[in-house]
């Protein structure tokens, strides 16, 4: 009987045309939404005149569908086994699962003015990005309507830069009509130990924004994972998003809708300093911000953003060192509301609930020769938002899968 | 020691065009920024435009109408200022200088070359 | 655009004097005034540099203070060779803007 259900198993989680794997992989049954909180800063003035702590205040969640769309340009390769295909993005924006609208206005750190003074750190170069966002009254804190800090404004300081530059900013721009990848993962029709095991990404098994193993493409997206999960095992995936590989590890045993599911979270370890887990090594990019590698829970993502100081941490800088979160009051960490944890069907190896969670922050340094940044006297990793993006089996699918799959075998 | 070198200038008429080098013999010539700057009869000197080392990002005060270019060749360790539209004011000795690697302005200066503008 | 006011126009001092030039910045430019001496017939030498810095090789008489928009250059003991046009240049922010000068003559 075993035997029987592994083989049914082993076919139908092959990502071929035909399979329930296929089906639920080009475009996912389950709705997938992303919520996000963003940190509307209560004392701009303090900050930039007194280098003061800043007093953040979260506001949210404002909700997003997300994942929507089928992947596009779905292509198999006979020969090596492997699926290729882009992932499009979009978002719509759900008014009654939000706290208010895209028209809600937030006090913000200048995005541009951040990244502009972190990329040009030549004095010379400094004192002419100074005239212009003089000139143009923009200062080292903003107000933006939801909307544009997510999906991108036209920056007034930006443009009156008299060179080709990209003038409009915003975390998330470009993402409607925009797709990640190429990704190429392979179908696991010679070897379902492979599947969905990604081989390729934007045509290479390397990201070039890291040292050594760090830089290496692990795993698999995290919507699936090879079939027969062991509690043992460490789940390996590569997420876009923050531009690397990353990890989760067993936790406990949870029923999802009557079936059986391992929760998989993403352990402190994985965002520990070299320090404490030297595996970690290759992630320390810079040794000043870092505090010579021993400062953690904060990944400096620059190199895979054209050099803006971006760095991702886990919401509210849960698992980061008391320094990244000393200079911003006002944040509560806690493992329930802010890790990430993903919840597999072992058999199958399925994700069917998941809540991924992370934040985004910016970096702004003290610039002698930037007046609006001139008072600062210290670096800050500044939380922008956090996002918490989550989905769950529908009841319908979940009765399927029970009566299908975990019903057979129990 | 740097040396800057400079040439091109002259007497010239109002309206005409005039094309400033200033050569220098440092090895390290692209990672400098460099910068035109001028001293009048009245002995004002004024900055007339500024390059940063690869040539990418130029600078021109407001006071100078962008009637002037500022350009560089870094493989031939040459700094330009192409000037046209000339006007009497703007007779002037022009120098070219180098800003110090910490960003300081003007570090070191050439000997300058004389433009007469004048009818 | 920051203005800057030098004083005085010209100034004959004997050999021995101490020298004072001041430079008055219209708008608050930290330590970031730099000071040039200009000998006739040649360009003009960096002496000071921002951050009241006297630039290696340039004797100790000179000196500099100040801070905000209140600066003063100073030559403790005049030497002939001393000789030369002064000019203060504020490079806080652009456009930079120079002093219109001091012309130092031997009494």
């Known amino acids: 009987g075993d035997l029987l259900i592994q083989k049914t198993i082993k076919k139908q989680v092959v990502l071929e045309e035909g399979t329930i794997a296929f089906k639920n992989w080009v475009k996912t049954g389950t709705e997938v939404y992303r919520q996000f909180w963003i940190f509307d800063v209560q004392n701009p003035q303090e900050v930039m005149m007194n280098s003061s702590n800043i007093q953040v205040k979260q506001r949210g969640p404002y909700t997003y569908r997300v994942r929507f769309l089928a992947k596009e340009n779905v292509t198999q390769d006979a020969e090596d086994n492997t699926v290729s295909f882009l992932q499009p993005n979009g978002a719509i924006f759900e008014p009654s699962l939000s706290v208010g609208t895209e028209a809600d206005n937030f006090t913000v750190l200048n995005l541009a003015v951040a990244a502009a003074s972190h990329i040009y750190q030549n004095q010379f170069v400094q004192m002419i990005l100074n005239s212009l966002i003089n000139k143009s009254k923009s200062s080292m804190f903003q107000v933006r309507t939801l909307r544009e800090l997510l999906w991108g404004y036209r920056d007034p300081f930006l443009s009156l830069v008299p060179y080709p530059v990209t003038t409009t900013v915003g975390l998330f721009y470009p993402y409607n009509n925009t797709a990640d990848g190429v990704y190429k993962v392979f179908n696991g029709k010679d070897n379902i130990s492979k599947v969905a095991i990604i081989d390729t990404y934007k045509g290479k098994r390397n990201l070039s924004y890291w040292e050594s193993h760090c830089d290496m493409i692990n795993g698999t997206d995290a919507a699936s994972f090879p079939p027969f999960v062991e509690k043992s095992q460490v789940l390996q995936f590569f997420s876009s998003d923050i531009c690397r590989s990353i990890y989760a590890v067993f936790e406990s045993d949870v029923n999802l809708k009557g079936i059986p599911v391992y929760r998989f979270v993403l352990p402190s370890k994985a965002f520990a300093s070299p320090v404490e887990n030297p595996d970690n090594y290759c992630f320390c990019t810079e040794k000043i911000i870092s505090k010579n590698c021993t400062s953690y829970g904060v990944l400096d993502i620059s190199k895979c953003k054209e050099g803006r100081p971006v760095y991702i941490s886990l919401p509210h800088f849960l698992y980061a060192s008391p320094d990244v979160s000393e200079p911003i009051d006002g944040l509560n960490p806690n493992e329930e509301e802010h890790r990430t944890y993903l919840d597999i069907e072992p058999i199958t190896g399925f994700t069917l609930q998941f809540a991924k969670r992370l934040q985004v922050n910016l970096l702004v340094k003290p610039s002698e020769k930037i007046q609006v940044l001139k008072n600062l006297k210290r670096n800050y990793i500044v939380p922008i938002l956090w996002l918490n993006e989550t989905g769950t089996i529908g009841d319908e699918k979940a009765n399927m899968f029970r009566s299908q799959v975990t019903g057979k075998i129990n | 020691e740097v040396q800057l070198v400079e040439s091109g200038g002259g007497v010239v008429q109002p309206g005409e065009s005039l094309k400033l080098s200033c050569e220098s013999n440092?090895?390290?010539?692209?990672?400098?920024?460099m910068s035109w700057v001028r001293k009048t009869p009245e002995r004002r000197l004024e900055l007339v435009a500024a390059i940063n080392s690869d040539g990418a990002i130029t600078y021109y005060p407001d006071t100078m109408e962008r009637r002037f270019i500022i350009s560089r060749d870094n493989t031939k360790k040459t700094l330009y200022l192409q000037m046209s539209s000339l006007k009497s004011e703007d007779t002037a000795m022009y120098y070219c200088?180098?800003?110090?690697?910490?960003?300081?302005?003007?570090?070191?200066w050439g000997q300058g070359t004389l433009v007469t503008v004048s009818a | 655009e920051t203005t800057v006011t030098q004083s005085p126009a010209s100034l004959s001092m004997a050999i021995g004097e101490k020298v004072t030039i001041r430079c008055i910045t219209s708008t608050d430019i930290d330590d970031d005034m730099n000071w040039y001496q200009q000998k006739p017939g040649e360009p003009p030498k960096l002496l000071i540099s921002e951050g009241n810095t006297l630039r290696p090789g340039v004797p100790s008489r000179f000196s500099s203070s100040g801070y905000g928009t209140d600066f003063v250059f100073t030559i403790e003991n005049m030497l002939s060779e001393d000789v030369a046009d002064y000019y203060c240049?504020?490079?806080?922010?652009?456009?930079?803007?120079f002093g219109a000068g001091t012309k130092l003559e031997l009494k």
């Open positions: 200088a180098r800003h110090g690697q910490t960003g300081t302005w003007f570090a070191y």
């Open positions: 440092e090895y390290e010539f692209p990672s400098h920024d």
């Open positions: 240049l504020q490079s806080d922010n652009l456009p930079l803007t």
